[in-house]
């Protein structure tokens, strides 16, 4: 590596993947390992993040970008960066202080992470439940009951023409 | 629910070993590494290294190098650490922590005083 | 190894105030940084991880903000349970190593 020879900064030459040596006359050195400058110019190399324990290497830290971590099989991140990693749950079940739960009567949970959410109230928006929530799916709603009430119609208007090359939403 | 449970206190003689046990029940012991952190009277935390029960692999803090030695029985789920040549400065309550990123779960902690 | 300092080292307050610890690390740690709460006797308890997001069963009245070397933990409006000594750890790269602590005591 050249010493730089700026009449400005003179580590402002010093490309990513290495750091302004001033113990060395300010001669750009590469990062030591374990460490990484992401950017030109600067005067020390951060260390790379670790993946150890419940946390496994997604990518391999180099000289120039730092390491990244997920969870292992079986575990989620949760916080920014995958600052944690919890456990998964079946369908069906939530993560408790007592380990993995099935939902109560009432709610769902469709994922292996997150809280078992109420079933929606189809009669809210005055319409019926046409199937049946469970604790891994929520119910589905149909028609309102007056819509299904003797003498009305079932059938539904027909759905308007789309224009070529568009998909339906 | 998630316990780590520790061994009772200890009282030693300078030079001697003490060895911390920590049992982890309602979690798979094996998911997550266990940490030790140690914090004498009136003192801020110290973490002294790490074990990793599935595979056995350990990480030390340099201060405790060539003095700890962290173990596991995963058998019995449980985590040990050991530390020879006691001295008086390492009169402390000694805490088994588990790993998920930050440390959520630690054990109630151990006293070990170092004494002649 | 990544050093860790906190300030104030301990404040006084009253019920109701709201106070700020802050933590600095002694090299960029992204949002690697954890918050406990110990009392007297007692085992440290995980409040905040990776920086802001807040532990499960953990009052909302706690929150965690920064990113880099310079976080803060607020506690929005102090109540008497929270007088206690706060400490930040980061969880970036071994060794792990833990502020000084803060010590919040009654006014």
């Known amino acids: 590596f050249e010493r730089t020879r700026s009449l400005q900064d003179p580590c402002s030459n010093c490309p990513a993947g290495t750091f302004c040596d001033n113990n060395r006359n300010q001669i750009c050195s590469p990062c030591p390992p374990n460490s990484f400058s992401s950017a030109g110019g600067q005067r020390t190399c951060d260390i790379c993040r670790q993946c150890k324990g419940v946390f496994r290497t997604r990518k391999e830290c180099s000289s120039t970008s730092n390491a990244e971590c997920d969870c292992t099989p079986g575990f989620h991140c949760l916080g920014a960066g995958c600052s944690m990693c919890e456990q998964d749950c079946k369908q069906g079940q939530e993560l408790t202080k007592k380990g993995c739960k099935d939902c109560c009567f009432g709610t769902f949970n469709d994922q292996k992470r997150g809280i078992c959410r109420p079933w929606t109230n189809c009669s809210l928006d005055g319409k019926s439940v046409l199937v049946n929530g469970t604790k891994e799916r929520d119910v589905v709603c149909g028609p309102s009951p007056a819509d299904l009430s003797p003498g009305a119609s079932s059938v539904t208007p027909p759905a308007p023409a789309r224009e070529p090359g568009h998909s339906p939403q | 629910q998630v316990q780590l449970v520790q061994s009772g206190a200890e009282v030693k003689k300078p030079g001697a070993s003490v060895k911390v046990s920590c049992k982890a029940s309602?979690?798979?012991?094996?998911?997550?590494?266990i940490n030790w952190v140690r914090q004498a009277t009136g003192q801020g935390l110290e973490w002294m290294g790490w074990?990793?029960?599935?595979?056995?692999?350990?990480g030390y803090a340099q201060k405790f190098q060539g003095r700890v030695t962290m173990t596991r029985n995963t058998s019995i789920s449980t985590a040990y650490m050991e530390l020879s040549s006691l001295r008086s400065e390492d009169t402390a309550v000694y805490y088994c922590?588990?790993?998920?990123?930050?440390?959520?779960?630690w054990g109630q902690g151990t006293l070990v005083t170092v004494s002649s | 190894d990544i050093q860790m300092t906190q300030s104030p080292s301990s404040l006084s307050a009253s019920v109701g105030d709201r106070v700020t610890i802050t933590c600095r690390a002694s090299?960029?740690?992204?949002?690697?940084l954890n918050w406990y709460q110990q009392k007297p006797g007692k085992a440290p308890k995980l409040l905040i991880y990776?920086?802001?997001s807040l532990q499960s069963g953990v009052p909302s009245r706690f929150s965690g903000s920064g990113s880099g070397t310079d976080f803060t933990l607020t506690i929005s409006s102090l109540q008497p349970e929270d007088f206690a000594t706060y400490y930040c750890?980061?969880?970036?790269?071994?060794?792990?190593?833990f502020g000084p602590g803060t010590k919040v005591d009654i006014k």
């Open positions: 922590a588990r790993e998920t990123g930050p440390f959520d779960y």
């Open positions: 309602g979690y798979t012991f094996t998911s997550y590494d």
């Open positions: 074990m990793n029960p599935n595979s056995g692999n350990t």
């Open positions: 090299q960029r740690i992204n949002n690697y």
């Open positions: 990776g920086a802001s």
């Open positions: 750890q980061q969880s970036y790269s071994t060794p792990f190593t």
